[in-house]
């Protein structure tokens, strides 16, 4: 807390300008009018204030707006945003995408901070859903943003927003998140033709069910091994050797290098060895010839 001291004669700030960088903390507190600061916030970012000086300016704004800053001030916070706490930000009502962009620009390149997470949360909740423009903006600044959301939060993403998602935005998503996103992507891209559809849906396939993988295997898509390795194990297990061969096309040879890793390892254990042998890759571990395979899950369902 800065002590209240009288402003020295002739030092009262008439405007927010570069002369203020020479003011000590107590002089800023005493000589800068909070209302003047609020109306000239757009000038602050051009002035090389120290973090200590910014603390004083923040204190002045906090006194002027105890219930939270108006958007006209928030939009021009610039580096002052770095001094805000999540508690400060929870008092704000940010509705303009331009304001959000301005504050994210200040944080560009930074790790995702609690301040930014709170800002985004307030903004998205205020909008009611994660619309395409917002998602476009957020993933531009934070490619991992989408994967930081819970499946429940992702359920509010409208299918139309999926068009804004880039493959790298899904790099850190887990299967539970892809389970939510995949049906939305399928809906969003449903009117595209085969090859174009596969290019768009590929990043989301970690959430695809068996029947969709079977359908893709009929379309000569030539899925790469990296995508195959991200598929849900339970979705891959029921696929036949012929279906996997069609799904992967020329990439089927890559199975050998991945035979010890899931889902390939588990899939091999479910296939007949003589079917695996038709691939000519030397895959081992399938069900020996002459053995009877009982589908116990089917039996349980019937009883």
């Amino acid at each position: 807390e800065v002590e209240k001291t009288a402003c020295p004669s002739g030092k009262k700030a008439r405007e927010i300008d570069e002369s203020l960088i020479f003011y000590k903390k107590w002089e800023l507190e005493a000589c800068v009018d909070a209302a003047l600061l609020a109306t000239q916030m757009d000038r602050v970012n051009a002035i090389p204030f120290t973090y200590e000086q910014l603390d004083v300016l923040k204190h002045k704004l906090d006194e002027l707006y105890p219930q939270g800053y108006p958007e006209s001030v928030i939009q021009h916070l610039g580096y002052l945003f770095l001094k805000m706490s999540p508690e400060d930000i929870r008092k704000w009502n940010v509705t303009s995408l331009e304001t959000l962009k301005a504050l994210l620009e200040v944080n560009k390149g930074h790790e995702m901070s609690p301040q930014v997470a709170t800002l985004i949360d307030r903004f998205v909740k205020g909008r009611g859903q994660l619309d395409k423009d917002t998602l476009d903006t957020l993933t531009a600044f934070y490619p991992g943003y989408l994967c930081s959301l819970s499946p429940e939060e992702l359920s509010s993403v409208p299918p139309s927003s999926i068009w804004a998602v880039r493959p790298q935005d899904l790099d850190t998503c887990d299967p539970r998140q892809l389970d939510v996103l995949y049906p939305k992507a399928r809906l969003a891209f449903q009117n595209m033709n085969g090859s174009e559809y596969f290019v768009k849906i590929q990043s989301f396939l970690g959430g695809a069910p068996t029947e969709d993988l079977k359908a893709l295997s009929q379309q000569n898509v030539s899925m790469d091994l990296a995508t195959f390795m991200k598929l849900r194990t339970d979705a891959v297990l029921p696929l036949t050797v012929a279906e996997v061969q069609k799904l992967l096309g020329p990439h089927v040879e890559g199975l050998k290098a991945e035979e010890r890793h899931r889902p390939v390892r588990d899939w091999i254990l479910r296939q007949r060895q003589d079917d695996l042998d038709t691939l000519g890759l030397g895959l081992q571990g399938g069900i020996p010839n002459g053995y009877l395979v009982l589908d116990l899950s089917m039996q349980e369902a019937l009883s």
């Epitope: 960088i21 120290t50 770095l82």
Partner: antibody, heavy 117, light 107 residues
Framework: QVQLVESGGGLVKPGGSLRLSCAAS????????MSWIRQAPGKGLEWISY????????YYVDSVKGRFTISRDNAKNSLYLQMNSLRAEDTAVYYC??????????WGQGTLVTVSS | DIQMTQSPSSVSASVGDRVTITCRAS??????LAWYQQKPGKAPKLLIS???RLQSGVPSRFSGSGSGTDFTLTISSLQPEDFAIYYC?????????FGQGTKVEIK
């Protein structure tokens, strides 16, 4: 008076790890942002990372992102830099500096990190 | 990233000479500029912040000026202890970047 003393440098093989420390005294450490800046032998200065007083705001330059981690312990008046997957180009003197936003007002004496097989 | 370019890269001068070092930013940085002095085997020392603000304890023969993209560090009368490398640094945007340095050596 303000003092910053780095330690933890040394010779490490490519791919190895090292943890640098910076002990601060003479000021209220918990009130200040802190930065790490490095200088390759015979070269200029490169700012690589900073951390806010509360640890909530962190930045890494692209060349170290994903490999280096900055942290601090305000109770111990200490700043740290955990360096993993080290490369030959990380060879440098590493300085910690007090970061006041518009400039770095105090610097440590530096600690030399050599990455070589 | 903002590029900082210093000129000249080195300057030979005598004690008592006036020395001027310039620093150019690749984009407008207002007055978000600092100057540092570094002697061999030592850490850099802050001379000037906010383009023209002299740090306490720094001799008044050092002065800084400029705004926007062009900045100058002037040593009005070079002293023996001033032979060193001088760096400019911008703090307008992240990452903070330094100039490549200007070496002031004895003629």
């Amino acid at each position: 008076q303000v003092q910053l003393v780095e330690s933890g440098g040394g010779l490490v093989k490519p791919g190895g790890s090292l943890r640098l420390s910076c002990a601060a005294s003479g000021f209220t450490f918990s009130d200040y942002y802190m930065s790490w800046i490095r200088q390759a032998p015979g070269k200029g200065l490169e700012w690589i990372s900073y951390i806010s007083s509360s640890e909530s705001i962190i930045y890494y330059v692209d060349s170290v992102k994903g490999r280096f981690t900055i942290s601090r312990d305000n109770a111990k008046n200490s700043l740290y830099l955990q360096m993993n997957s080290l490369r030959a180009e990380d060879t440098a003197v590493y300085y910690c500096a007090r970061d006041v936003g518009s400039h770095f007002d105090y610097w440590g004496q530096g600690t030399l990190v050599t990455v070589s097989s | 990233d903002i590029q900082m370019t210093q000129s000249p890269s080195s300057v030979s001068a005598s004690v008592g000479d006036r020395v001027t070092i310039t620093c150019r930013a690749s984009q407008d940085i207002s007055r978000w500029l600092a100057w540092y002095q570094q002697k061999p085997g030592k850490a850099p020392k802050l001379l000037i912040s906010a383009a023209s603000r002299l740090q306490s304890g720094v001799p008044s023969r050092f002065s800084g000026s400029g705004s926007g993209t062009d900045f100058t560090l002037t040593i009005s009368s070079l002293q023996p202890e001033d032979f060193a490398i001088y760096y400019c640094q911008q703090a307008k945007s992240f990452p903070r970047t330094f100039g490549q340095g200007t070496k002031v050596e004895i003629k």
